[in-house]
């Protein structure tokens, strides 16, 4: 079986041809012995050891010798440079045939089958594994919320998918998978996703079975996630450098001295399988998830927690019926920080 | 208003197996979860399984590798595979449905149970 990738550049065929006596043959000399090979296209003659044993044309002949000697043994090693191969390739054959003007009548021809086993090359990479996000305020009810900015702080992932460099044409589909952090283990909400978009040449979203993307059809904001309020602006997180300082939240303040994480390998958060297929495109394709912090259920919930660490997963892979195209799958992580927003609580009043 | 049905517990011995069965009828709410849960005798009621309305799939720690749960969707159905049963997960299974988003014990519709018995 060849683990085919295109780093492969050679292919080594070590032939050993002997002349020994058996209980049907005395072994005589054998004239004019020749070896035969008929090998594909995708196959190119680079060197042979013994050097001049082989000559090559459509079909490759080696000479043994003449007489190859009655117990000779001899050892070819011949080097094909790896042209052809594609994604159609399903193996390689070559076909080898002894022959010799001394008599031997059993010189059937013998057949070399190679699997072959592609490998795509490919990568998944992340602009910002970590986000830094928030809670407080007071609750709101799903009836009550109008547009995505009534949910929470914003969150906004982006994935990178690597050209392949090969095109599937049909052969299969690369698809990234997310294991979103979707419920808390309650069964309220956690990260409340808004819109996926796949930008390759062009952009358009992806929706996943199930309806799971804004399932309360909430009115998307404006590009840019433009924040509803002032009160919201001052705490909206940037990392490209926006205005304003960050939000002063107690964890940074209390340098996090309580901290929980959620995470759906614990039970702790419930996650669904949000799948997006790539396209078959020679660029690099960017994968972008925009979602929200569900407010309410932290303050609920989480209010004794300076901050809440949630997980989730992110895996590229390949679906395809084809059992000699593989791809390792690429797996990553993505997480919130979600800190809570520092309220001063004043002291008592003394009567 | 959902109603749900849940059938084919009973009493079986360590190791076996179970198919329980959950029927849900009345108007059902898309996108949703289906869930099961588990009460043993004296203790709250804790979470086994759930799917949701796209396929995706979760489980407690101590069912995983031992329960599946399935649904189908044009018979209003959610299904719990039980295998390798153990004395410890005797108890009544109650199915439930919510939409996603909302807390189980506010917001979901529950059947009446039906028990299981794991002998040793």
């Known amino acids: 079986r060849l683990q085919y990738s295109r780093d492969v550049r050679k292919l080594l065929l070590s032939i050993n041809v002997t002349n020994t006596r058996t209980s049907e043959r005395s072994g005589e000399d054998a004239h004019e012995a020749l070896l035969t090979l008929v090998v594909p296209p995708a196959l190119l003659l680079s060197s042979v050891r013994p050097p001049g044993a082989c000559q090559a044309n459509e079909t490759i002949f080696c000479e043994l010798g003449n007489p190859f000697k009655r117990n000779q043994r001899m050892e070819l090693l011949i080097a094909f440079e790896v042209i052809g191969v594609t994604l159609h390739t399903r193996d390689l054959q070559v076909q080898l045939q002894l022959s010799t003007s001394s008599h031997q009548d059993n010189l059937w021809p013998m057949i070399l089958t190679l699997l072959v086993d592609y490998t795509l090359q490919t990568s998944l990479s992340m602009v910002n594994h970590r986000l830094q996000s928030f809670f407080g305020g007071t609750v709101m009810g799903e009836s009550g919320m109008k547009t995505v900015e009534d949910v929470g702080s914003p969150l906004k992932y982006e994935f990178q998918v690597g050209p392949m460099g090969e095109g599937l044409v049909g052969l299969g589909t690369l698809v990234l998978g997310l294991e979103w952090p979707y419920e808390v283990s309650n069964g309220k909400w956690l990260l409340y996703p808004t819109e996926i978009t796949v930008h390759g040449n062009g952009s358009w979203p992806c929706r996943p079975p199930g309806d799971l993307i804004n399932p309360l059809n909430l009115t998307l904001s404006d590009p840019g996630d433009r924040p509803s309020s002032p009160q919201r602006r001052r705490r909206q997180l940037d990392p490209g450098g926006g205005q304003g300082p960050p939000p002063v939240t107690l964890a940074a303040a209390k340098k996090a001295k309580s901290e929980t994480v959620l995470t759906c390998a614990t039970g702790r958060a419930h996650c669904v399988w949000l799948e997006c297929p790539i396209p078959d495109a020679p660029v690099v394709t960017n994968v972008t998830v925009k979602a929200r912090v569900w407010n309410s259920t932290f303050i609920e919930d989480y209010r004794d927690f300076d901050r809440v660490r949630v997980n989730g997963w992110a895996t590229l892979f390949l679906r395809t019926s084809i059992p000699t195209i593989n791809m390792e799958n690429k797996t990553t992580w993505f997480s919130v920080d979600i800190d809570s927003e520092l309220v001063e609580e004043l002291p008592a009043e003394i009567e | 208003e959902v109603q749900l049905v849940e059938s084919g517990g009973g009493l079986v011995q360590a190791g076996g197996s179970l198919r329980l069965s959950c029927a849900a009828s009345?108007?059902?709410?898309?996108?949703?979860?289906m869930g099961w849960f588990r009460q043993a005798p004296g203790d709250q009621r804790e979470f086994v399984a759930n799917?949701?309305?796209?396929?995706?799939?979760n489980y407690a720690d101590t069912v995983k590798g031992r329960f599946t749960i399935l649904s189908d969707n044009a018979k209003n159905t959610v299904y719990l595979q039980m295998t390798s049963l153990k004395p410890e997960d005797t108890g009544v299974y109650y199915c439930s449905v919510k939409r996603v988003g909302q807390s189980w014990f506010d917001s979901g519709y529950w059947g009446q149970g039906t028990q299981v018995t794991v002998s040793s």
């Open positions: 009345g108007r059902m709410f898309s996108p949703n979860v």
């Open positions: 799917i949701y309305s796209g396929g995706s799939t």
